[in-house]
């Protein structure tokens, strides 16, 4: 078959030079960070209004509460992304009305409805990982068989524990070591 460049691992979504993995199982915030690290990614850090709109849409479409890589665990009231960068004032508009309210030690941020909410970090929620898309140069063996750029996610709750992350890892390894024909 025709060999095409597929910039993201299977079941990851490409958007503006990055790949996003929307989980189908749920973990607490810290374990979500670990899950993303296990696949060479990071719990999502939002860098632009376009990226925010894209991710918010993904989350609201699936009607899921979804962790992002933002918390005020280091200093109460000072929100910081997991890459160490601060939450800029122009991004504070994305908090839902009345949030962040820190009711009962809510130190981690999630996509909730049409905006952001702070919630308890030990609660299990879906999560989104982000990493740079492949360059697709021939030298790096990134030419792969046709695949949907944005595959339909399995129904909510269909992911079994760590299965979706392990599958993503296997698929990612496979894509980096094989050509599909």
């Amino acid at each position: 078959t025709e060999r095409l460049c597929h910039p993201c691992p299977w079941e990851w979504t490409f958007f503006q030079g990055n790949c996003y993995f929307m989980s189908n199982s749920q973990r607490n915030w810290h374990d979500s960070i670990t899950a993303c690290k296990e696949v060479g990614a990071q719990l999502v850090v939002i860098k632009s209004a376009e990226e925010q709109n894209f991710l918010q849409l993904q989350s609201s479409r699936s009607n899921r509460f979804t962790w992002m890589g933002l918390s005020d665990l280091n200093q109460e009231g000072t929100w910081q992304w997991v890459d160490g960068s601060p939450l800029l004032p122009s991004f504070k508009q994305y908090w839902n009305r009345g949030e962040p309210n820190n009711v009962g030690e809510e130190d981690c941020a999630e996509f909730s409805g049409n905006g952001w909410n702070d919630d308890k970090c030990n609660l299990a929620k879906f999560w989104i990982c982000k990493k740079s898309a492949a360059s697709c140069s021939r030298d790096e063996e990134q030419f792969l068989s046709p695949a949907p750029a944005t595959p339909n996610p399995p129904p909510a709750g269909s992911g079994g524990g760590l299965n979706d992350i392990f599958e993503a890892q296997k698929i990612e390894w496979h894509e980096h070591h094989h050509h599909h024909h």
Partner: antibody, heavy 119, light 106 residues
Framework: QVTLRESGPALVKPTQTLTLTCTFS??????????VSWIRQPPGKALEWLAL???????YYSTSLKTRLTISKDTSKNQLVLTMTNMDPVDTATYYC???????????WGQGTLVTVSS | DIQMTQSPSTLSASVGDRVTITCRAS??????LAWYQQKPGKAPKLLIY???SLESGVPSRFSGSGSGTEFTLTISSLQPDDFATYYC????????FGQGTKVEIK
């Protein structure tokens, strides 16, 4: 109407600390979405953003200058203070304070104050 | 940090000319861009915000366009009062200004 006015020394010696004050009116820094920033412009050169403080009292600094800068506010006096340590002749510039609309663009500016660093 | 590159650095034009200034961002900034006009000895003045929104009181001959990484400021018919230096500024990640474009009399 919204006004901002910078004040501080016109001349500073090398290695000294510069303290600038911005006095503003027509808005409150405790109102959601309000931010005030410091921006400088060396003679004949481009604008350079230095620091910003927002309504939550969160502070943001230029990556290249953050070890030398401190920004603070006195909401009751409608004042903003910037301190810059270890001044050098290359820091000679006009220093502006400006309101940042929701932490984005600068819609109101002070007239600026020229600070010369020389021994 | 995001770098902003303006072109040209200097632009010679005559009254009545259509003038276009370009600003490029080193990474995507959505439409989070503003344009300012500055005259010698004066503070900058906001012209355009969010790439294409005209600030209140700014003449309609000024317009802005673009999204992502490439933006333009257009003056449809240059007036004597428009000879000045123009700066773009991004506010997607911290705050960065371009190096400026001086519009001078031809």
């Amino acid at each position: 109407q919204v006004t901002l006015r910078e004040s501080g020394p016109a001349l500073v010696k090398p290695t000294q600390t510069l303290t600038l004050t911005c006095t503003f009116s027509g808005f409150s820094l405790s109102t959601g979405g309000m931010c005030v920033s410091w921006i400088r412009q060396p003679p004949g050169k481009a604008l350079e953003w230095l620091a910003l403080i927002d309504w939550d009292d969160d502070k943001y600094y230029s990556t290249s200058l953050k070890t030398r800068l401190t920004i603070s506010k006195d909401t009751s006096k409608n004042q903003l203070v910037l301190t810059m340590t270890n001044m050098d002749p290359v820091d000679t510039a006009t220093y502006y304070c400006a309101r940042a609309h929701s932490g984005s663009y600068f819609d109101f500016w002070g007239q600026g104050t020229l600070v010369t660093v020389s021994s | 940090d995001i770098q902003m590159t303006q072109s040209p650095s200097t632009l010679s034009a005559s009254v009545g000319d259509r003038v276009t200034i370009t600003c490029r961002a080193s990474q995507r900034i959505s439409n989070w861009l503003a344009w300012y006009q500055q005259k010698p000895g004066k503070a900058p003045k906001l012209l355009i915000y969010k790439a294409s929104s005209l600030e209140s009181g700014v003449p309609s001959r000024f317009s802005g366009s673009g999204s992502g990484t490439e933006f333009t400021l257009t003056i449809s018919s240059l007036q004597p009062d428009d000879f000045a230096t123009y700066y773009c500024q991004q506010f997607n990640s911290y705050w960065t200004f371009g190096q400026g474009t001086k519009v001078e009399i031809k």
